[in-house]
Every structure is written in C-alpha cells, then in structure tokens.
C-alpha cells in the first residue's frame, strides 16, 4: 500500500446490559499480551453473534476499551482485564475508542497493527479554520462590490 494510513479517533461511552450469555465479546491485550506494538491496551477481537454487544451494535472489532465502569484498563495483565469484565455486574459502562481508517482504502475499523493515527480534532480544527478564512474573505469581497 502506498502512502500513509491515517485514522480518525473517536471516543464513545457504551452502556451494555449483560445478556443471558454475558456481554458477548472477546478481548486481546494487556501488559503480558501486547496485541499492538508498544501498546498494552485492551482491544475487542471478536463480537459474538446475537450477544449483548452485537445486539447493541456500537462496539466493533478493533475498538480499544479504555475503561469499564469508570475503572481504567491501563497497565493490566490480560487475565486481570478479563476478570474485570466478568465481575463488572449487570449494567456495564464501557469507555471505547473507535479508530476509523480515513486514507488509502475504504473506511473501516482497524483490526490489528500499528495504532498510530490522527485524533479527530487535528482534522477538524484546520478544516474549521479554513472555513472561517474563506467566509471572512467572501465577506470582504462583497463589501468591496
């Protein structure tokens, strides 16, 4: 693939209700199981068909889970992260980071590999600034007519 692959990074709070068979997804990552180079974060590796996560529809494979019920998932062993989910109770609040590919190919969730991407504000701020400059220039042009 030529050029750079960039990502739009967005965060979302997802509230799941544990179903009859649980939350319905698998995770990878942890300090003892690095899924992404130089990142010991916890990532979604599988969404189970007809599970709570699948029925909710917002959690995607490749998403990074930042916290569970407000508890940070940084620097956890893999099994400790698994246990945190299993003991999270009936109503589970997930803080999730979605990473959408925005260049070199169709938009889609990143599955695995280098997590380096550009945060959404780094894209939106220049776009907003350019829009403001264009609007100002247009107003000046109209005043001169």
């Amino acid at each position: 693939m030529n050029g750079r692959v960039d990502y739009l990074v967005t965060e979302e709070e997802i509230n799941l209700t544990r179903g009859p068979s649980g939350l319905g997804f698998n995770i990878v990552g942890g300090t003892d199981q690095q899924y992404v180079s130089n990142d010991s974060g916890i990532y979604v590796s599988r969404i189970k068909e007809n599970g709570a996560a699948a029925l909710d529809g917002r959690l995607q494979e490749g998403d990074k889970i930042l916290s569970v019920n407000g508890q940070d998932l940084k620097n956890l062993l893999h099994q400790d992260a698994v246990d945190l989910f299993r003991n999270a109770g009936y109503a589970v609040s997930l803080r999730v980071q979605h990473r959408l590919q925005v260049q070199n190919g169709p938009i889609g969730h990143r599955g695995e590999g280098d997590p380096s991407g550009i945060p959404i504000f780094m894209v939106l701020v220049p776009v907003f600034a350019l829009t403001m400059v264009a609007a100002w220039a247009f107003m000046r042009y109209r005043q001169q007519l």
């Epitope: 649980g22 698998n26 979604v44 893999h78 695995e112």
Partner: nanobody, 127 residues
C-alpha cells in the same frame, strides 16, 4: 483470516501413541485460544481438549483425561495433542479450532460456538 492445518494422524495399534500438530497462520497466534475436537461421520463434534493463549490453563474431556495432553508453542504458531494409551474408540477425525482473544464471559471451552476458525482435520485410526 486464520488458517489451521492439522497433521500427525495415522494408523496405530491399541495402546500406542500419536502426536497431532495444528499449525496456525497469523502474527498474533499468542492471543489465540485453541482447542481440539473430534468428529465421527454423521455425529456431532465432540470436545477433546483446549488451551488458553499462554498455555497456563488446559481443559480436557473426561474421556481423554490422563491419556491426552494439549500444549502449545507460541514461537512456532503450533498447538499439539499428545495422545497416549489409544483405544479403538479414539478412531475418528481430529479437528483443530481457534478463536482470537479471550471471552469476557464465562469460558465454555467445550462449546464449538466459542471458536471461529476450524481446520480440515486429520484421521486417527486405532486398530
């Protein structure tokens, strides 16, 4: 996608041993939970053994406990099934299964629905 290729099957006498191998593709093999199932023609898949991503936890069907041992080598992207004291009733096709990552729910290693990827299988015949 993950590809699984089994090998090591064959014909062996009752009481003998065989070692099955399952080679997996993918650079994140060390995150896969792996299992062996077996399937006779016209019958449902039967759970044999499973192993977690690190090899620290193993699970066995009662029918093979004490005779079979599951292990893995993450450097070689391979999971093994050492089968000792083989019986004629162990004659069947052995299939390797995998899933990426650990379930955040109760782990049911004997449930085929826990796994996404399946090999073609290798025939074991005990005479």
């Amino acid at each position: 996608d993950v590809q699984l290729v089994e090998s090591g099957g064959g014909l062996v006498q009752a009481g003998g041993s065989l070692r099955l191998s399952c080679a997996a593709s993918g650079r994140t093999f060390s995150t896969y939970e792996m299992a062996w199932f077996r399937q006779a023609p016209g019958k449902e898949r039967e759970f044999v053994a499973a192993i977690n991503w690190s090899g620290s936890s193993t699970y066995y069907a009662d029918s093979v406990k004490g005779r079979f041992t599951i292990s893995r080598d993450n450097a070689k992207n391979t999971v093994y099934l050492q089968m000792n004291s083989l019986k004629p009733e162990d004659t069947v096709v052995y299939v390797c299964a995998a899933v990426i990552g650990s379930t955040v729910d109760e782990y049911r290693p004997s449930d085929p629905l826990e796994y996404d990827y399946w090999g073609q299988g290798t025939q074991v015949t005990v005479s």
